[in-house]
């Protein structure tokens, strides 16, 4: 209706799943009981609702499209199982139950994947103390994580932080076709005589449904 305000989306249920696993999307809070005999599942895409699955009289029916081969009913007719989760599945889903009563329920799927062990490469050959400049010390690469992991740099086991005119950390990421991220972080620093034998390494910190985790690279001198 022209001039009509958009209704805010009710707070969705959050479902977390690792890449490759099966995500269970429940039509309503787990404590909700009742005979959900008729449910329609939608994918919310650019404010449009795209029908992806129907439940009618306890039977599931896949709709043609990108999800048709990965959706099935799980135990209860109120739970939709999405198999082989990928980062592209990190979306908002909506189930509309028509019986026992008319209601909308939103489910937000969050996807996670641990990055591979970070690789590190030293960029500096020798320390030049006459240079009043930032020098590239090392490059750290963490492949195939989701979402983008955080990178931390360490010098002699002490965390290094961005510091004006002394330490600069430039991180960039590329999205692989799989939707996973490869993170590249370049550490630049002013090097002094005392850094001759310093050990540098990077650490990726990331989250999974099971909690927070981290992976460390090897050390470089």
């Amino acid at each position: 209706v022209p001039g009509e305000e958009k209704q805010p989306v009710p707070t969705p249920d959050l479902v977390e799943a690792e890449v490759g696993s099966t995500a269970l999307l429940k039509c309503g809070p787990s404590r909700a009981s009742g005979n959900f005999s008729q449910v329609d599942w939608f994918l919310i895409h650019k404010e449009r609702q795209i029908l992806i699955f129907r439940v009618h009289q306890g039977k599931g029916q896949r709709e043609p499209g990108e999800y048709e081969h990965r959706l099935s009913l799980q135990d209860s007719v109120a739970t939709l199982a999405l198999s082989h989760v990928t980062p592209h599945d990190e979306r908002m889903f909506l189930c509309k139950s028509k019986r026992p009563r008319l209601q909308d329920h939103y489910v937000e799927l969050q996807v996670f994947k641990a990055p591979e062990e970070p690789t590190i490469q030293a960029n500096v050959v020798g320390i030049h103390v006459d240079r009043q400049e930032l020098r590239e010390v090392a490059t750290c690469v963490g492949r195939n994580g989701y979402p983008i992991p955080q990178v931390l740099w360490y010098k002699n086991s002490l965390p290094l932080q961005e510091e004006e005119n002394r330490v600069h950390i430039q991180s960039s990421q590329i999205v692989e076709s799989s939707g996973l991220y490869t993170l590249k972080s370049v550490l630049s620093a002013r090097l002094v005589k005392e850094d001759k034998d310093a050990q540098f390494y990077c650490e990726l910190s990331y989250r999974l449904p099971s909690g927070n985790h981290m992976k460390e690279s090897k050390e470089v001198t």
Partner: antibody, heavy 120, light 114 residues
Framework: EVRLVESGGGLVQPGKSMKLSCVAS????????MSWVRQAPAKGLEWVAS????????FCRDLVKGRFTISRDNAKSTLYLQMDSLRPEDTATYYC?????????????WGQGTSVTVSS | DIVMTQSPSSLAVSAGETVSIHCKSS????????????LAWFQQKPGQSPKLLIF???TRQSGVPDRFIGRGSGTDFTLTISGVQAEDLAIYYC??????????FGAGTKLELK
């Protein structure tokens, strides 16, 4: 905004001393190497001295070695140039400059200068 | 010390012209450790302090118009100003900061109107 403000210049007799100051603001002074550069009237630029961020390393051009001393007080964000045994050829505008490490140590910010005249 | 030889010492131009200023160093300013040339160009307008235009021989400082172009490597460098404007009238200095214990400047090139 990065600002460098020099002061302390003026007229001084040959053989006397003078101390120049440069107050920095708008950046973390204690993280930067700093330099003094001078320019004699109608002449070119001449590097005078540099100092490391912590103040432990100082470098001076040969012509002023033993007469000029560069120092800094990081707590006050101030750079100094102590000039002793001044000569007429030290007459110049003295600029302080910041050295940007991300640019290889180039002088990326300059003060407006303070004029020193050595004359009897 | 590294000696910087700048030419010409002065240059008379008309607005809109393209001019080049040359700078030669007595030794290479290309540092093998970083593969960068430690050469800068400064602009100094009458009564003002020098202003950094170019560092690492060809990298424009933030806010510098793209009509200022730095080129060169090793010992030979050029600053080109394409389409000179009245506000570009100034003295231009090259400077080596390869040897950071003894920075040296060229003698300067005065850019004036014909």
């Amino acid at each position: 905004e990065v600002r460098l403000v020099e002061s302390g210049g003026g007229l001084v007799q040959p053989g006397k001393s003078m101390k120049l100051s440069c107050v920095a603001s708008g950046f973390k002074f204690s993280n930067y190497y700093m330099s003094w550069v001078r320019q004699a009237p109608a002449k070119g630029l001449e590097w005078v001295a540099s100092i490391s961020d912590g103040g432990g390393d100082t470098f001076c051009r040969d012509l002023v070695k033993g007469r000029f001393t560069i120092s800094r007080d990081n707590a006050k964000s101030t750079l100094y140039l102590q000039m002793d045994s001044l000569r007429p050829e030290d007459t110049a505008t003295y600029y302080c400059a910041r050295r940007g490490a991300a640019m290889g140590g180039v002088m990326d910010a300059w003060g407006q200068g303070t004029s020193v005249t050595v004359s009897s | 010390d590294i000696v910087m030889t700048q030419s010409p010492s002065s240059l008379a131009v008309s607005a809109g012209e393209t001019v080049s200023i040359h700078c030669k160093s007595s030794q290479s300013l290309l540092y093998s450790g970083t593969q960068k040339n430690y050469l800068a160009w400064f602009q100094q307008k009458p009564g003002q302090s020098p202003k950094l235009l170019i560092f690492w021989a060809s990298t424009r400082q933030s806010g510098v118009p793209d009509r200022f172009i730095g080129r060169g490597s090793g010992t030979d460098f050029t600053l080109t100003i394409s389409g000179v404007q009245a506000e570009d009238l100034a003295i231009y200095y090259c400077q080596q900061y390869y040897d950071t214990l003894t920075d040296t400047f060229g003698a300067g090139t005065k850019l004036e109107l014909k």
